[in-house]
């Protein structure tokens, strides 16, 4: 049997077949003579009592009510009471992406490891015997897989498996049709041993500017998740106004590590702005590791073998 | 748009405790690394910790047996045990965290609460 819906804040999409089961099903069948009631209260509405006359999408079932299928004004709280036993559910129904096969707040992240076992089953217990058929999607690009009624998924995982998978399960009801999507996203990792942090490029980089004009530092590093990447300019806060860290960008590598890049950016560079240090640092729990960039004035060139420059 | 919100600074005597925290406002599709930053009066902004999705964390020397930072990704909340503070732990504390607005996007951007105070002094 299909547990009771013990969560007490759901979210569900709209236009999706819904239940609600509560958790003293066993002990309801014993006194089948007691009063049950299910109750719908939001806003403005308290407490008005929920049945099949409420809506025609509303369905009683001993312990279950059901939604067919469950729309954005059915957002509120759910009370079942049956003698002295109450149950109560905080319900928020939202709105279905109408361009995408799916919903984004209404998905499940799993990381695999790669070459580990991975596997995805579709199947819904509850609406079993309602169900034609199911389809399995990746990226909302239907899978063609053998089975129609329980499409499965068991490989061992490799780089490319990494997407939205999303079960589609399609169901008849009193002569309509209705589809309820279960949807995961498989983020595929390498071993999940940390790495040792690594900026790239040079350790030291002189960069050729002329006064007035602006300049972009950037500061890219291999790193574990938990790192950090930031810049170091002078002992005094940002107290140069021409001075901007700009926000940190992360992408995952395909070996399920992160390549970060940060960016310094100085406007109207000034006298002030030559022949300092500007540090960048990545800080992992091993320790630190430091780049750092030089602004020299464009006529000093000369000076400096051509070797030590960067763009 | 996405907003970080922190709360729980406060003015506290040498040697408390305080309990930081900071939650996202605004559609979020996923949350990569959530950190802690600080900037007292005339300095420059430092990192403090931070903490990745499955609970890796990492802490500067500074503050290192003293703070601990913990997160509950069911809230997309991080946290920020302050413990054994010293005068010179004051400044104003801001949380930063690592956001993936959409499915879409491939790419996760740092985005930055406006801060809470925490002053240490007797």
């Known amino acids: 049997a299909e547990s009771c819906t013990s969560r007490p804040h759901i979210t569900v999409v709209e236009g999706e077949p819904f239940y609600l089961k509560h958790c003293s099903c066993s002990l309801a069948h014993e006194i089948e003579t007691t009063t049950k009631s299910w109750y719908k209260s939001s806003g403005s509405q308290e407490h008005v009592e929920l049945n099949p006359r409420s809506s025609s999408r509303i369905a009683l079932h001993d312990c279950v009510l059901e939604f067919w299928p469950v729309e954005l004004n059915d957002t509120g709280s759910y009370f079942f009471q049956m003698k002295n036993y109450t149950q109560k559910w905080k319900l928020n129904v939202i709105r279905r992406n109408k361009h995408s096969c799916f919903t984004e707040r209404q998905v499940t992240s799993k990381i695999v490891e790669v070459k580990k076992f991975f596997q995805i089953t579709c199947e819904n217990s509850y609406y079993q015997t309602l169900v034609n058929s199911t389809s399995l999607y990746k990226n909302c690009k239907k899978l063609l897989l053998e089975n129609n009624k329980n499409p499965t998924i068991k490989k061992n995982a490799e780089f490319e498996d990494q997407g939205y998978y999303s079960c589609v399960h399609f169901l008849h009801h009193n002569g309509k049709l209705f589809n309820i999507t279960k949807t995961f996203n498989i983020t595929i990792v390498e071993d999940r041993s940390n790495i040792v942090p690594v900026l790239l490029g040079p350790k030291l980089n002189h960069v050729a500017v002329e006064l007035g004009k602006n300049v972009r530092l950037n500061c890219s590093a291999l790193l574990n998740e938990e790192d950090v990447i930031y810049w170091m300019f002078g002992e005094e806060n940002g107290s140069d106004p021409n001075i901007h860290e700009e926000k940190e960008m992360r992408i995952m590598t395909p070996e399920g590590k992160w390549h970060a890049s940060k960016v310094l950016r100085i406007e109207n560079i000034g006298e002030s702005n030559l022949n300092v240090l500007y540090n960048c640092t990545v800080a992992s729990t091993g320790g630190t590791d430091t780049k750092s960039f030089i602004l020299v004035r464009k006529a000093d060139m000369a000076d400096i073998p051509g070797h030590v420059f960067t763009r | 748009e996405v907003q970080l919100v922190e709360s729980g600074g406060d003015l506290v005597q040498p040697g408390g405790s305080l309990r930081l925290s900071c939650a996202p406002s605004?559609?979020?599709?996923?949350?990569?690394?959530m950190r802690w930053y600080r900037q007292a009066p005339g300095k420059q902004r430092e990192w403090v910790a931070s903490?990745?999705?499955?609970?890796?964390?990492n802490y500067a020397n500074s503050v290192e047996g003293r703070f601990t930072v913990s997160r509950d990704n069911a809230k997309n909340t991080v946290y920020l045990q302050v413990n054994s503070l010293k005068p010179e732990d004051t400044a104003v504390y801001y949380c930063?965290?690592?956001?993936?607005?959409?499915?879409?996007?491939?790419?996760?951007?740092?985005?930055w609460g406006q801060g809470t105070q925490v002053t240490v002094s007797s």
């Open positions: 930063n965290a690592l956001i993936k607005p959409s499915s879409t996007d491939r790419i996760f951007e740092e985005y």
């Open positions: 605004g559609s979020i599709f996923s949350i990569n690394a």
């Open positions: 903490i990745a999705t499955g609970g890796n964390t």
